[in-house]
């Protein structure tokens, strides 16, 4: 008795984070024995789509010509071979940006900070939101979440960093969102460059832009300070 068919691989091109209106292609790669591919979307009737394999039959293409809210979500794919259906692929989370207005990201008291001191990144949205995300470019784990606990909505979230070290330096953006869909994000904020200068205690020079994928501030959990606990926002690392 042969074992279960190996699960296919699922991915998106040009990536899994897509701006509203842009095109995206979802690929499902199985085996050369595949006769049909099926794509399922969580919380949608199954199958979400079916495609015949492309030669040499080991993969199928699912095209989204223009990204909209209804395409954002969690997908899995399967393939059918002469012996039956495969195991499901690992999930693909397709995220749409541009669902909400562009937030503003600023650094308090300044984006120029001395090592050992404190800085707070402030993400402000135009309309009340319940989730704020801080992203550091080229970080291994780029997401920092502040999420409202009771659906309470606010116009801003604070991301305190203390004490600041050279690894905090780099380029940050923030997004805002509503908890009803983790797959819908705002437009990205303009980038904010956080520049960490040395001090007497820490004379090492700090790059003005983080170029490594080594640990960044998101790998050093910090308790929210200031107004954040009172605003009902809770921190999550992903």
């Amino acid at each position: 008795q042969a074992g279960p068919l190996p699960k296919p691989t699922l991915w998106a091109e040009p990536g899994s984070v897509i701006s509203w209106g842009n095109s995206v292609t979802i690929w499902c790669q199985g085996t050369l024995e595949a006769r049909e591919y099926r794509l399922d979307k969580e919380e949608s009737p199954a199958p979400w789509d079916r495609q015949n394999p492309l030669e040499p039959k080991n993969k199928a293409r699912f095209s989204i010509p223009s990204m909209t809210e209804d395409y954002a979500g969690r997908y899995r794919c399967y393939y059918r071979s002469p012996v039956g259906w495969s195991q499901p692929s690992d999930p693909l989370e397709l995220v749409m940006t541009g669902a909400y207005s562009k937030p503003t990201l600023s650094a308090l008291p300044s984006p120029l900070v001395t090592s050992g001191k404190s800085v707070t990144l402030l993400c402000q949205s135009r309309s009340p939101m319940d989730t704020f995300l801080l992203i550091k470019e080229r970080a291994a784990h780029p997401l920092l979440h502040l999420r409202s606990e009771h659906g309470a909505q606010q116009h801003q979230a604070e991301f305190p960093m203390s004490p600041v070290t050279s690894v905090h330096g780099g380029t940050y953006r923030c997004f805002s969102s509503h908890g009803f869909s983790h797959y819908l994000l705002s437009h990205p904020s303009d980038p904010l460059e956080l520049i960490v200068s040395g001090s007497l205690e820490d004379p090492r020079p700090s790059p003005t832009r983080s170029v490594s994928t080594a640990a960044g501030p998101e790998d050093q959990p910090l308790m929210p300070t200031g107004s954040v606990p009172h605003s009902g926002l809770r921190r999550h690392w992903e």
Epitope: Y100, S101, S127, L184
Partner: antibody
Framework: EVQLVESGGGLVQPGRSMKLSCAAS????????MAWVRQAPTRGLEWVSS????????SYRDSVKGRFTISRDNAKGTLYLQMDSLRSEDTATYYC???????????????WGQGVMVTVSS | DIVLTQSPALAVSLGQRATISCRAS??????????IHWYQQKPGQQPKLLIF???DLASGIPARFSGSGSGTDFTLTINPVQADDIATYYC?????????FGGGTRLELK
């Protein structure tokens, strides 16, 4: 205070063109998605078109697709609507508006200009 | 397109509660959010956003305005009605493209 001032309306013959402008002030124009909404006595309020803050994406209602072009100049703080091949059914007051986002779920209109009248008639 | 139906007019006395309804031809809910929005338009003026996402009060709008409902049936409540509230009220949906408006309800004095 947010201010949106439309201009460029008037009387135009069917098949001809017209360009509306909207001068924005009192907010960071380059951060806001924008839209045009029109209002005709016979058809009520109708969303016409939207554009992202950077001009990178646009959206149109089916009846104006291929005839109208929305654009913006962030340096000037101005939104535009180029209207070609105009029809009598395009007769309406056209409003310039800020929009939460170009995405359908967020196409609600938080600030409105005073509107400009476009009459398409021979 | 999603069609939003509003009754053309509602007569109300000053100081009383006004309830303006809006019915959608299909659900305008997305998860726990209801994608309906309310506007006020006075004669000769542009519309003004009152309520977004069914129940969130827009900036600068007095608390006597409130919104409720889910799925296909929504209500804008004004309590108490003041003379300045005499206007036409429109609902709008953003669940499906294109965004569409109701025909408007004219609020009149009894």
């Amino acid at each position: 205070e947010v201010q949106l001032v439309e201009s460029g309306g008037g009387l135009v013959q069917p098949g001809r063109s017209m360009k509306l402008s909207c001068a924005a002030s009192g907010f960071t124009f380059s951060n806001f998605d924008m839209a045009w909404v029109r209002q005709a006595p016979t058809r009520g309020l109708e969303w016409v078109s939207s554009i992202t803050y950077d001009g990178g994406s646009t959206s149109y209602r089916d009846s104006v697709k291929g005839r109208f072009t929305i654009s913006r100049d962030n340096a000037k703080g101005t939104l535009y609507l180029q209207m070609d091949s105009l029809r009598s059914e395009d007769t309406a007051t056209y409003y310039c508006t800020t929009v939460e986002s170009i995405a359908t779920i967020s196409t609600y209109f938080d600030y409105w200009g005073q509107g400009v009248m476009v009459t398409v008639s021979s | 397109d999603i069609v939003l139906t509003q009754s053309p007019a509602l007569a109300v006395s000053l100081g009383q509660r006004a309830t303006i309804s809006c019915r959608a031809s299909q659900s305008v809910s997305m998860s726990r959010y209801d994608l309906i929005h309310w506007y006020q338009q006075k004669p000769g003026q542009q519309p003004k956003l009152l309520i977004f996402r069914a129940s969130d009060l827009a900036s600068g709008i007095p608390a006597r305005f409130s919104g409720s409902g889910s799925g296909t049936d929504f209500t804008l409540t004004i309590n108490p009605v003041q003379a300045d509230d005499i206007a036409t009220y429109y609902c709008q949906q953003t669940r499906k493209s294109p965004p569409t408006f109701g025909g408007g309800t004219r609020l009149e004095l009894k």
